[in-house]
């Protein structure tokens, strides 16, 4: 069999054998070494020595294979635009950030680079549960039968309602999706409004 | 998945002028190196003109003088200028970038010139 060519090699048609770890040099119609990740092209290749990498500085970085001269800052994630950072910028990675809690995503390029407070929902709604906390804005959907929600919150869920007889009580006044059960000592009497009618 | 579509080919006269256009679409982004190559008929593809992210152009000795290469990276697209067109330029020109900060390469369908 062939013996693999090692960059840098003579490429005729534009194209390299290792799309993901090299690349293709059109004024020297050859193929040289990318950087691997964390690093940065020190000295280009050229038609008799290969692509020279060095490592990225600190508070800098490169996450893919490339052919960069630098290595890219790091940025923080910026409080101001309701993000927060949950890894750290390595030499290989820049600095992943999220939304704050209780915000959203309300602008996206390649990442969120924006967030925005997520909309209440009213009573007798709850926040339809997410794949992914933070990617968009609250959908309020009604709660199911047998549970209320009595706030207007971006995350309060409904709950179910009070069996009074679990608590050796009796219901007063049923639940609705947007208060409790009532319920009462089986020995008070009704309030007058409630009671049946009365025989003579 | 990157497109690049070329536009502006066409019939022309000796000393005419053309402007091609080649406009990347779908998941652009990042950092790239912009190249007009050509295919004269029956001959190998030719490099033609860089743009490099780094802002840098070169020119084949061919075309050294006549032809201009930019970049507007607002809209995705890169151009080439074409002034005093010959005979000899006449060939399908083709549109090729590749990502500099990441694995990537891609290629235009062509737009042929004639002179």
């Known amino acids: 069999s062939q013996p693999q060519a090692v960059p840098p090699y003579a490429s005729e048609n534009q194209t390299c054998r290792d799309q993901e770890k090299e690349y293709y040099e059109p004024q020297h119609r050859i193929c040289c070494s990318r950087c691997p990740p964390g690093t940065y092209v020190s000295a280009k290749c050229s038609r008799i020595r290969d692509t020279v990498c060095a490592t990225c500085a600190e508070n800098s970085y490169n996450e893919h294979w490339n052919y960069l001269t630098i290595c890219q800052l790091c940025r923080p994630c910026d409080p101001v635009m309701g993000l927060e950072e949950i890894a750290p910028c390595t030499s290989k990675r820049k600095t992943q950030c999220r939304c704050q809690p209780g915000m959203f995503c309300a602008a996206w390029a390649l990442e969120c680079t924006h967030c925005e407070l997520l909309s209440d929902c009213p009573p007798g709604t709850e926040a339809e549960l997410k794949d992914e906390v933070g990617k968009g804005n609250n959908h309020c959907v009604p709660c199911k039968a047998g549970h209320f929600q009595n706030t207007s919150s971006p995350s309060a869920r409904c709950q179910p309602h009070t069996r009074c007889e679990n608590q050796g009580l009796v219901e007063a006044a049923p639940g609705t999706a947007q208060s409790d059960t009532t319920c009462k000592n089986p020995l008070e009497p009704l309030p007058p409004e409630m009671s049946g009618t009365m025989l003579m | 998945e990157v497109q690049l579509v070329e536009s502006g080919g066409g019939l022309v006269q000796p000393g005419g002028s053309l402007r091609l256009s080649c406009a990347a679409s779908?998941?652009?982004?990042?950092?790239?190196?912009m190249y007009w190559y050509r295919q004269p008929p029956g001959k190998q593809r030719e490099l033609v003109a860089i743009?490099?992210?780094?802002?840098?152009?070169n020119y084949a000795d061919s075309v050294k003088g006549r032809f201009t290469i930019s970049r507007d990276n607002a809209k995705n697209t890169v151009y080439l200028q074409m002034n005093s067109l010959r005979p000899e330029d006449t060939a399908v020109y083709y549109c090729?970038?590749?990502?500099?900060?990441?694995?990537?390469?891609?290629w235009g369908q062509g737009t042929l010139v004639t002179v």
């Open positions: 743009s490099t992210s780094g802002g840098h152009t």
């Open positions: 779908g998941r652009f982004f990042g950092i790239y190196d």
């Open positions: 090729n970038i590749q990502r500099v900060d990441a694995p990537g390469m891609y």
